[in-house]
């Protein structure tokens, strides 16, 4: 069968910024901000499109030793990622794969909404049990706060490249980032 | 501890308006989104709109729209919440509230102000 | 606009009851449903969010439930310290967010 979990969460970052961190260079960064929840991400295959295969290990002391994950698509424009966990973790006698979409929405105050969904795959007529699916949350939550702290924390990271910086303009002209696009922004 | 302090009562004329301060401490001030909710005596909840202390982007419902200006100052953790224009109806009591920041649902409202009383009489 | 409306308005009842409050949404809002406790003079409190999750601190008697558009709070058996006026309030997806009237909870 097939079992479908939504979830919806907020951020106060910018949905590009996000998406750039926390999704495009999430196999960085989640080891670096989060190695209590991630020991390393590994490139099996692929490079980093649709067909990739990769390998996420898992520190001691945490349920599963690693996952493997297929990459499915990567929209750069509308924000939204799929992957499927394929091998490792849950998957076994009862668990075919797990579908997973990610779309980051921006919002009219300059942050994001995070639209998740999990597609549990069960053979047969297996049941998902609570407790995975609460753990996938955790996880999420996990990684996703760690990402979210290190972009408040280094607010030159993952933005766009200027051109021109503020020194360059002897302080007196401020540069119009991503951030002061949304700045003020009343819907 | 995590907390929101609110500025005091005030009291208004009509057409005039007021400016309620919110500060926040115990936790990353512009990590998450702080809602302002108004409550008219011995009415129910009714909420104005929220402020994203990180980039200073505001969202206000329609009701508030040209009226309301949400506003806040890193630099002292503190969001305000401006109402122009005053009449009667406005008299409530105004709160500044943190969002829960929840994997599981959006906006809901974890940690609240206590609230400031807006007396808007001629 | 999202409309929200709880059942009933106002409710009696003893220490050590079991007390059930309805709230229904004018459209599905999926599991994105919080409830709040109000006592007089005092800021709302949140006591369940996502229709079923217990906020921290809150006392087990407290337990929500319900998907799509009706939900429940209920209240195992009755303290002193819950009568109070209760809120239910939705946040799906976007704003704007809406709040129940309000029920409150007397004692008889």
């Known amino acids: 069968g097939v079992f479908n979990y939504e979830t919806e969460t907020t951020s106060v970052i910018p949905a590009a910024r996000l998406f750039k961190a926390f999704i495009l260079d999430g196999d960085n960064l989640f080891p670096k901000v989060a190695p209590q929840a991630i020991s390393s991400v590994e490139n099996i295959e692929g490079n980093g499109g649709p067909g990739t295969i990769k390998k996420i290990s898992f520190p001691e002391g945490l349920p599963f030793k690693y996952v493997k994950d297929r990459v499915d698509e990567v929209d750069h424009t509308n924000f939204k990622y799929n992957y499927a966990v394929i091998e490792g973790g849950p998957i076994g006698d009862t668990l075919e794969k797990i579908s997973n979409e990610i779309k980051i929405v921006a919002t009219p105050d300059g942050g994001s909404i995070l639209k998740i969904s999990n597609k549990y795959h069960t053979k047969g007529d297996h049941e998902v049990k609570a407790e995975q699916v609460k753990a996938s949350k955790e996880m999420g939550e996990t990684l996703l706060r760690a990402v979210e702290s290190y972009l408040l924390a280094h607010s030159d990271a993952y933005n766009e490249q200027k051109l021109i910086s503020e020194e360059d303009l002897g302080g007196e002209q401020k540069l119009i980032s991503e951030e002061d696009l949304h700045h003020h922004h009343h819907h | 501890q995590v907390q929101l302090v609110q500025s005091g009562a005030e009291v208004k004329k009509p057409g005039a308006s007021v400016k309620v301060s919110c500060k926040a401490s115990g936790y990353t001030f512009i990590a998450y989104y702080l809602h302002w909710v108004r409550q008219a005596p011995g009415q129910g909840l009714e909420w104005m709109g929220l402020?994203?202390?990180?980039?200073?982007?505001?969202y206000y419902t329609q009701k508030f729209q040209g009226r309301v200006t949400m506003t806040r100052d890193t630099s002292i953790d503190t969001a305000y919440m401006e109402l122009n224009s005053l009449r009667s109806d406005d008299t409530a009591i105004y709160y500044c509230?943190?969002?829960?920041?929840?994997?599981?649902?959006?906006?809901?409202?974890?940690?609240w102000g206590q609230g400031t009383m807006v007396t808007v009489s001629s | 606009d999202i409309q929200m409306t709880q059942s009933p308005s106002s409710l009696s009842a003893s220490v050590g009851d079991r007390v059930t409050i309805t709230c229904r949404a004018s459209q599905s809002i999926s599991s994105y449903l919080n409830w709040y406790q109000q006592k007089p003079g005092k800021a709302p409190k949140l006591l369940i969010y996502?229709?079923?999750s217990l906020q921290s601190g809150v006392p087990s008697r407290f337990s929500g439930s319900g998907s799509g558009t009706d939900f429940t709070l209920t209240i195992s058996s009755l303290q002193p310290e819950d009568f109070a006026t209760y809120y239910c309030q939705q946040s799906y997806s976007t704003p704007p967010i809406t709040f129940g009237q309000g029920t409150r909870l007397e004692i008889k």
């Open positions: 996502a229709a079923s």
């Open positions: 509230a943190r969002d829960k920041r929840s994997y599981y649902i959006p906006y809901a409202f974890e940690i």
């Open positions: 402020l994203n202390p990180y980039t200073g982007g505001s």
